[in-house]
Structure formats: C-alpha cells, structure tokens
C-alpha cells in the first residue's frame, strides 16, 4: 500500500502552503525506500536517493514556481509515481448568515472569508439549544447535531425545515480543504431573523366619484404558512407621480383607502409586511402598483371598503364608513377580511 496518505481532493495531488516547507511523498514505493525526484519534463535531478529522506522530497519555502508535476523513480529506474503539487492556504472560518421568510423554516448561506486556492467543501449541521434550569440566560447545545441539508448544484445554502419559532439554534458551517478545517458557529433565533417576503397581488383602484381616494388591496405572501397563529401587519406607502416623498400608513388589514390622493395624478403604491408582534424585520417593498383617482360622479351608496382616513376631502358628506377592522387581521384564507370583530375574537 502507498506510504502517502491521500488528502481530500483529486487523486495524485499533494498540497502545501506558500512560504512553508513542503514534503512530497512518492506514492508507488514502500515507506523509507530511497527514490530520485525530477520535475516532469526536466532531466535535472532535484533530489537523489542518497538524500537520507527516503520516499519524500522536501521543498523549503515553497512558492508558486514549485507548483506542478513531479516524478519519483526507484533505484532501478522504475517509475515510483507522479505527484502534482498545488499550493494554497488552510481554510479560514466562513462567513455565515441566516434568514427566514416564515416562522417554520430558515436557510443559512455562507461565503469563504478568505480564498484558499484549494479544493474546498462545506459541512453544515445544526443543534437546537435548550435552557438550563430556571436561569433562562444559561443555554447549552443539547439536541442534535442534525445535518443542515445543502442545496443541490453547489449553491452555498442549507435549509432547516420544521424549526420551532421560540427555540434557539446553533448553526455549524465548517470549511474543509486538504490543509485542514475551520468552523464558524452562529447562534440563530427564528424570531430575530424572520423577514417575510413582500405582500403579493397589490392592486390600486379608483373609488368612483371620489377624486381624492384610491383603494389598495393585497394578499399575504405565498410563502407565509396558512396557520392563523402568526399574523402579519402591513405598512403602505404612496406618492403622486413625480413627487419624491412617500406618505406612510399602517393599514389594519389587507386593504387601505387613501383619502388624500392628488386629484388627476397617477399614484405609486407599495406595501411591506412584518410579523404582527414585531419579530424580525419588515419585508422588502412589494413591486409598485399604480392607480389614478376617479373623476366621475358620487355613487348613491358607499361599499364597506374598510377604514377611511379622516383627512378633509372636497367632497359631499355621506353616511359614515364601515367600522374599522381589528388590527390583528387573521390570515385571509381562513377568515374573510370583512368578517366582524366578534368573529375575529372567537379565533383570537
């Protein structure tokens, strides 16, 4: 058997670090057998069999000119093997960040903090951390580790499915190359990394007969689970065309009637979402949707379109609008967004 341990990486390649002494090992001989060493394609003897180094070639302070293929021969001139030297660096701890678009799953991505120049792979796992005793500040890794399954096709990402919202996790990402391994540990709480996807299906419609009103409606992001336990709250911004500043409101549900639009001008509207108890951060903004207030006449009745702002409008007084909806709006697929306060309270 070969006296040379096979480092992780392609066969026949041995590895070293620039500026350091490097030992190359002749793979096809018995340990200690004296061999001669040559650079591939060069007749000059690099190290003879009388060096006292047996089957090894020592390169002091290796640099890039030492990279390439080497040939070792036994005393009788037989080929002991060929070795390719590749220089690079041991791994540094990778940089890891984790994010969650819902309260049941999270993903972690990583990048090398330093390029090693060598074949590299990553090992990914996680543990659930549990509280020790009554003192909730004291935590220690307890259950696991479990593998964090990596995306196929070499994307630097792994996903933890079925995570517990109130638990803490310790993520382990280890960078491995032929010169060693280096581990980054990252403590993650779903509550702090939660960032929903932006709301979907944003529509902006005029309100017939009201030249300063626009009705915006949207839906939960498709990635948000259907269970009603964790709701989203929303932030809506709007501005007239060519106007640089956004106006911001926090609607109570999945629609909003803007009452201070500029008559005759198109308006851009966008919405963002966040966990209703302020876990994590606001989503990115949805793509903008556009709408222009109506210029038509006033209808005889007002549909119950939800909470109307009370900014003054140059419009006739009409019956008072529908009562405001509760601020903790359930998931639209489970309760219609016009259901009454009483019905909402049953599920709360």
């Amino acid at each position: 058997s070969s006296p040379c341990p096979q480092a992780w990486g392609p066969p026949g390649v041995q590895y070293g670090q620039p500026g350091r002494s490097v030992k190359l090992c002749c793979p096809g001989v018995t340990a200690g057998d004296p061999v001669s060493w040559f650079r591939d394609g060069e007749p000059k003897l690099l190290q003879g069999p009388d060096s006292g180094l047996g089957h090894e070639l020592v390169l002091a302070q290796a640099d890039s000119t030492d990279e390439g293929t080497y040939i070792c021969q036994t005393l009788d001139g037989a080929l002991g093997g060929t070795v390719t030297l590749q220089l690079g660096y041991p791994p540094a701890r990778p940089v890891v960040s984790c994010q969650a678009a819902d309260y049941e799953n999270f993903s972690c991505t990583w990048s090398p903090s330093q390029i090693s120049g060598l074949p590299t792979r990553y090992l990914t796992s996680y543990r659930k951390k549990t509280v020790l005793g009554a003192d909730s500040q004291r935590r220690s890794p307890s259950t696991g580790p479990w593998p964090c399954p990596q995306d196929p096709l070499g994307a630097a990402r792994c996903v933890v499915h079925g995570a517990e919202f109130w638990s803490q996790y310790r993520i382990n990402v280890t960078e491995v190359n032929p010169l060693g391994a280096s581990t980054r540990l990252l403590d993650v709480s779903l509550q702090s990394i939660l960032r929903p996807d932006p709301p979907q299906g944003l529509r902006v419609e005029s309100v017939p007969g009201y030249p300063r009103r626009l009705r915006a409606s949207w839906t939960y992001p498709a990635s948000w689970p259907c269970q009603p336990h964790f709701l989203l709250k929303f932030r809506l911004q709007y501005r007239p065309a060519q106007h640089p500043a956004w106006s911001t409101v926090e609607p109570a549900g999945l629609e909003e009637v803007i009452t201070d639009a500029v008559a005759g001008l198109p308006h851009a509207v966008r919405v963002s979402a966040r966990d209703f108890l302020d876990a994590g951060t606001w989503s990115t903004w949805s793509p903008e949707a556009w709408g222009t207030p109506s210029t038509g006449t006033i209808p005889k009745e007002i549909p119950a379109w939800g909470q109307l702002h009370t900014q003054p409008e140059v419009e006739p007084q009409v019956d008072s609008p529908a009562p405001p909806r509760p601020s903790l709006q359930p998931h639209p697929r489970l309760l219609d967004h016009r259901d009454s306060v009483e019905q909402v309270a049953v599920l709360a």
Partner: antibody, heavy 118, light 107 residues
Framework: EVQLLESGGGLVQPGGSLRLSCAAS????????MTWVRQAPGKGLEWVSS????????QYADSVKGRFTISRDNSKNTLYLQMNSLRAEDTAVYYC???????????WGRGTLVTVSS | DIQMTQSPSSLSASVGDRVTITCQAS??????LNWYQQKPGKAPKLLIY???NLQTGVPSRFSGSGSGTDFTFTISSLQPEDIATYYC?????????FGPGTKVDIK
C-alpha cells in the same frame, strides 16, 4: 510591496455623502475579505464594515447600518465605502484593513480623515 | 454585540519594567482575541493574534495569554519605543469589537 492606500476623505456637511476608496497592492486582493475601521479624534477604534472576497456577504456596525454601503471591485483591486446621511459623530479617520479570517487585521492603510461639520 | 473592557486605561512605567494589561470579554470568545499597538498619528499594528501567537516581526518581549473571557497582554521589559496605546479586539463573531485601549507611557 504589500500596502493599502485610502482616499476620498474630506469635509462634508451633515446629511451629505462621501465615497471612500482603498487601493490594494502587493497581494491577491480577490482572495481576501476587506474591512473598514474608524477612529474618532482622540477616541478608540471602531469596526465599521466588512465584505467577503466575492462581495456576496457584507456586515455593518449598527451605528452605520442603512447609511453606509461597502463594496469592492476585484478587477481594480479596490475597496469602497459609500457614506450617506452623514452625521457629526461619523467624523473620524477611516482605515482600510485586510483581515485574515474576517477579523484578524494584519494589514492597515494609513487612513483618510472624514470631517462632518456645518 | 460582544463588549470588551480593558484595564488599566493608562499606565506609566519605567524602562525595563514588566507591564501587564488585561482584557475581558462580555461572553466566551474562545481564543479569538488580538492585540494591537497604535502610536500617535499612525495606523494600528497587529502584535498578538489568537490570544497568544506573536505576529511575524514583532519583538519577543510582547506576549499574550488567556482564553474564554479573560486575557492578558505583557511587555516583559518596557522600551522607549513601546510608548503607544494598546487595544484588544475580539473576532469570535461577525461583528469584531475593540477594547477602549490602554495608554502606556514612560515615567
């Protein structure tokens, strides 16, 4: 010679913007994470921001998050710091540094002074 | 963020004296701790990395020790050129933090 050279500092009004550059030479810039560290006059060192070799991960101190953007151009061996909405407390010497393993700063530039004042 | 404290904040010693500075982290940082020297008007210079490793080219009178939360930096025999401010710095996590510094001068 291995070195880092910062530029782009100067006097700017509160609310203004400035872009710092750091030119690297003497090492394989695209293999290393890079960092900005600052030092207010007469004060200690404060880490500002770091970026991985690919540019795919960035990290910011809470004090600058949302206002500063770190970036790099590996083809030009240059690191950048775009500073917006500047405040008086951003007044400092800004150093560019090359870390090993993200946070071990073994090479520093000479620094460039940013003064935010009206 | 991990907080770093240093003591003393300043000290005066005679040439040849042994000087010790301590650094404490608000949580366990393993051995991910570095020590820097900064002279007035100059950039910081790395002296010790990973708590106890001497950076190449740094005189052997500088040394460091410790792990976890408590660390020590020592100048075994203070020299006039060692007048500077010394900073500890952790890099256990992705947001490195520095200690407030210790100013060293000659009596």
């Amino acid at each position: 010679e291995v070195q880092l050279l910062e530029s782009g500092g100067g006097l700017v009004q509160p609310g203004g913007s400035l872009r710092l550059s750091c030119a690297a030479s003497g090492f394989t810039f695209s293999w290393y994470s890079m960092t900005w560290v600052r030092q207010a006059p007469g004060k200690g060192l404060e880490w500002v921001s770091s970026i991985v070799p690919s540019g795919g991960h960035t990290q910011y101190a809470d004090s600058v998050k949302g206002r500063f953007t770190i970036s790099r151009d590996n083809s030009k061996n240059t690191l950048y710091l775009q500073m917006n909405s500047l405040r008086a407390e951003d007044t400092a010497v800004y150093y560019c540094a090359k870390p090993e393993d993200w946070g071990l700063f073994d090479l520093w530039g000479r620094g460039t002074l940013v003064t935010v004042s009206s | 963020d991990i907080q770093m404290t240093q003591s003393p904040s300043s000290l005066s010693a005679s040439v040849g004296d042994r000087v010790t500075i301590t650094c404490q982290a608000s949580q366990d940082i393993n051995n991910y701790l570095n020590w820097y020297q900064q002279k007035p008007g100059k950039a910081p210079k790395l002296l010790i990395y990973d708590a106890s490793n001497l950076q190449t080219g740094v005189p052997s009178r500088f040394s460091g020790s410790g792990s976890g939360t408590d660390f020590t930096f020592t100048i075994s025999s203070l020299q006039p050129e060692d007048i500077a401010t010394y900073y500890c710095q952790q890099y256990d996590n992705l947001s490195p933090t520095f200690g407030p510094g210790t100013k060293v001068d000659i009596k």
